[in-house]
């Protein structure tokens, strides 16, 4: 079983959308605002971001046995990042650069999370840490770190969906 209610996700659609997310996350990275990377310091601000780990059932065997565990983990991460992208970290000053695809990224995170959890089904979502940077440079730094961890997250999710589309599609 894959998603609540016992149905499988649309693996191919998920694969396409996760591939698009990879492209968007990669292209967004240099476009969150001008920043001096020497400022990059403490890691604590992004310690709480979701990671897909060994025990999450996202390996080929885990996906075959019961993909729900892995899909729930991916879903939690998508919601987590979607909330961050809609938060003051990205909407506050300094403004995003005009080329930034953050709106596309936000929409795609939402789109993929909806594919994984059709209306009426509810998985518990991870608490969003209260990151409210007061200084513009702190916001830039956080954007940079969030997008870097998002890149890693969607790269793993894309591999999961590629595997699912190839081996688990009905």
């Amino acid at each position: 079983r894959a998603v609540p209610g016992g149905s499988s996700p649309a693996w191919t659609q998920c694969q396409q959308l996760s591939q698009k997310l990879c492209t968007l996350a990669w292209s967004a990275h240099p476009l969150v605002g001008h920043m001096d990377l020497r400022e990059e310091g403490d890691e604590e601000t992004t310690n709480d971001v979701p990671h897909i780990q060994c025990g999450d059932g996202c390996d080929p065997q885990g996906l075959r046995d019961n993909s729900q565990f892995c899909l729930q983990r991916i879903h939690q991460g998508l919601i987590f990042y979607e909330k961050l992208l809609g938060s003051d970290i990205f909407t506050g000053e300094p403004s995003l650069l005009p080329d930034s695809p953050v709106g596309q990224l936000h929409a795609s995170l939402l789109g993929l999370s909806q594919l994984l959890q059709p209306e009426g089904h509810h998985w518990e979502t991870q608490q969003i840490p209260s990151l409210s940077p007061s200084q513009p440079w702190q916001r830039l730094l956080l954007r940079f770190k969030i997008l870097r961890s998002l890149q890693a997250f969607v790269a793993v999710a894309a591999r999961v969906f590629a595997h699912g589309a190839a081996t688990l599609s009905p």
Epitope: T23, A28, L31, P98, P101, G103, Q104, A107, S108
Partner: antibody, heavy 116, light 107 residues
Framework: QVQLQQSGLELVKPGSSLKISCKAS????????IHWLKQRPGQGLEWIGW????????EYNEKFKGKATLTADTSSSTADMHLSSLTSEDSAVYFC?????????WGQGTLVTVSA | DIQMTQSPVSLSASVGETVTITCRAS??????LAWYQQKQGKSPQLLVY???TLAEGVPSRFSGSGSGTQFSLKINSLQPEDFGSYYC?????????FGAGTKLDLK
């Protein structure tokens, strides 16, 4: 500075095909999306699709699937749009533009007239 | 697809006047909305993005506001170079869609 230079006006026959080019300069071509848009005389703007030259990912507006094909040549920093089976409905100005969703940089437009 | 409804379709005003153009999205687009100006025979030019951020080089008499589904573009103290067509466009997902435009001409 960022520039997008499009190929010149085209007069083509119904049923034929056409390639419009958009040469980018002044920035890293592989790092930004190139969008294509259509504007018929006196009308609004329609989004055709985008290409990301960094990995050649493309996405099309459903309405233009089968009509437009987007490609990019990273060696010449040029994005192309191929239009097939042209009819009078395809007569329009076609623009390329750079952006992630909003479009801060535009080509000058290519006027395409389809006429027997 | 998200539909963008712009009003008014046309607008006549004099130099020095203040005008407001509105745009409604058929669903929530957060603050992912852009405004463009287009002169006859030219390419559109980005004025405002993310609903309220002025693009580089755009005079401060232009201002954008709104979020969710309701947006507006205000032009204070119209200048001769402001006459032309204005379009709104959402940039929340694809396909990108535009309003039908507002033609602003000299009264």
């Amino acid at each position: 500075q960022v520039q997008l230079q499009q190929s010149g006006l085209e007069l083509v026959k119904p049923g034929s095909s056409l390639k419009i080019s958009c040469k980018a300069s002044g920035y890293s071509f592989t790092s930004f999306f190139i969008h294509w848009l259509k504007q018929r005389p006196g009308q609004g703007l329609e989004w055709i699709g985008w290409i990301f030259p960094g990995n050649h990912d493309v996405e099309y507006n459903e309405k233009f699937k089968g009509k437009a094909t987007l490609t990019a040549d990273t060696s010449s920093s040029t994005a192309d749009m191929h239009l097939s089976s042209l009819t009078s409905e395809d007569s329009a100005v076609y623009f390329c533009a750079r952006g992630g969703g909003n479009l801060p940089y535009w080509g000058q437009g290519t006027l395409v007239t389809v006429s027997a | 697809d998200i539909q963008m409804t712009q009003s008014p379709v046309s607008l006549s005003a004099s130099v020095g006047e203040t005008v407001t153009i509105t745009c409604r999205a058929s669903e929530n687009v957060y603050s992912y909305l852009a405004w463009y100006q287009q002169k006859q025979g030219k390419s559109p030019q980005l004025l405002v993005y993310n609903a309220k951020t002025l693009a580089e080089g755009v005079p401060s008499r232009f201002s954008g506001s709104g979020s969710g589904t309701q947006f507006s573009l205000k032009i204070n103290s119209l200048q001769p170079e402001d006459f032309g067509s204005y379009y709104c466009q959402h940039h929340f997902g694809t396909p990108l869609t535009f309003g039908a435009g507002t033609k602003l001409d000299l009264k």
